[in-house]
């Protein structure tokens, strides 16, 4: 018959044969043969493999390091990755949690709508029109633009979001 | 790698007064928001106030609004805390906190005890 070149879920191919992939958990040992099936090992302690795979190697378990804040939320098994997350009152910096902060900044054309808490991290709100924010910062509001008028001035330079707007005198000149 | 280091806690009794400082090395202070945390024993962090990196904007939580008064010193790379008024229930260890905040930067924090 004629060597597959195509196999089926949970298979592989090699040297024009399929042979199973290892479950979760597992590693590869040795392919199969002609005669023998796919040898495979299970992982081991503090290590993991989450998808059925030809792998030689499991992956490590993921360390949540106390020096960064961190703490394990969920122990990892023979199928699973370590789940970290950050102490009590501090705020993981992606959703991978690698490290922790008090809290986040609003960047500069953003405001804070709700300063941080013990449980739930900074919200921030774009600056709409009329308002901006030149820095980052935790708790400032977008701030609204200057008012030229009140002070007997013109806008020379429009305000964005990032920037107030710029007074200067009126021009007296008359034609 | 910055380094904030706090001073200025003890013991002092109900209504009195308390200045703490915050004395940053290691990086730049000039132009960082900063912020004072502190920790109740057994509690949680508690943000208590923050100041901009201008000086010009200042933040209080509610429970020292009026008692407490933040401001910075950026020729001497210290934020400072004024502490007025003090009661029992501002016992804590305080923290100062300089952008972005991350739990590297944390310094030991400074012992406040208001007792009779």
């Known amino acids: 018959p004629e060597p597959p070149t195509a196999c089926r879920e949970k298979q592989y191919l090699i040297n024009s044969q399929c042979c199973s992939l290892c479950q979760p958990g597992q590693k590869l040992v040795s392919d199969c043969t002609e005669f023998t099936e796919t040898e495979c090992l299970p992982c081991g302690e503090s290590e993991f493999l989450d998808t059925w795979n030809r792998e030689t190697h499991c992956h490590q378990h993921k360390y949540c390091d106390p020096n960064l804040g961190l703490r394990v939320q969920q122990k990892g098994t023979s199928e699973t990755d370590t789940i970290c997350t950050c102490e009590e009152g501090w705020h993981c910096t992606s959703e991978a949690c690698e490290s922790c902060v008090l809290h986040r900044s609003c960047s500069p054309g953003f405001g804070v709508k709700q300063i941080a808490t013990g449980v739930s991290d900074t919200i921030c709100e774009p600056c709409p029109v009329g308002f901006f924010s030149n820095v980052s910062s935790a708790f400032e509001k977008c701030h609204p633009w200057t008012s030229c008028e009140t002070k007997d001035l013109v806008v020379q330079q429009a305000g964005t979001n990032k920037t107030d707007v710029v007074c200067g005198p009126q021009d007296r000149l008359r034609a | 790698e910055v380094q904030l280091m706090e001073s200025g806690g003890g013991l002092v009794q109900p209504g009195g007064s308390l200045r703490l400082s915050c004395a940053a090395s290691g990086s730049t202070f000039a132009g960082y928001e900063m912020w004072w945390y502190r920790q109740a024993p057994g509690k949680g962090l508690e943000r208590v106030s923050?100041?901009?990196?201008?000086?010009?904007?200042?933040y209080y939580a509610d429970s020292v609004k009026g008692r407490f008064t933040i401001s910075r010193d950026d020729s001497k790379n210290t934020l400072y805390l004024q502490m007025n008024s003090l009661r029992a229930e501002d016992t804590a260890v305080y923290y100062c906190?300089?952008?972005?905040?991350?739990?590297?930067?944390w310094g030991q924090g400074t012992l406040v005890t208001v007792s009779s």
């Open positions: 923050a100041i901009s990196g201008s000086g010009r904007s200042t």
């Open positions: 906190a300089k952008d972005p905040y991350s739990f590297d930067y």
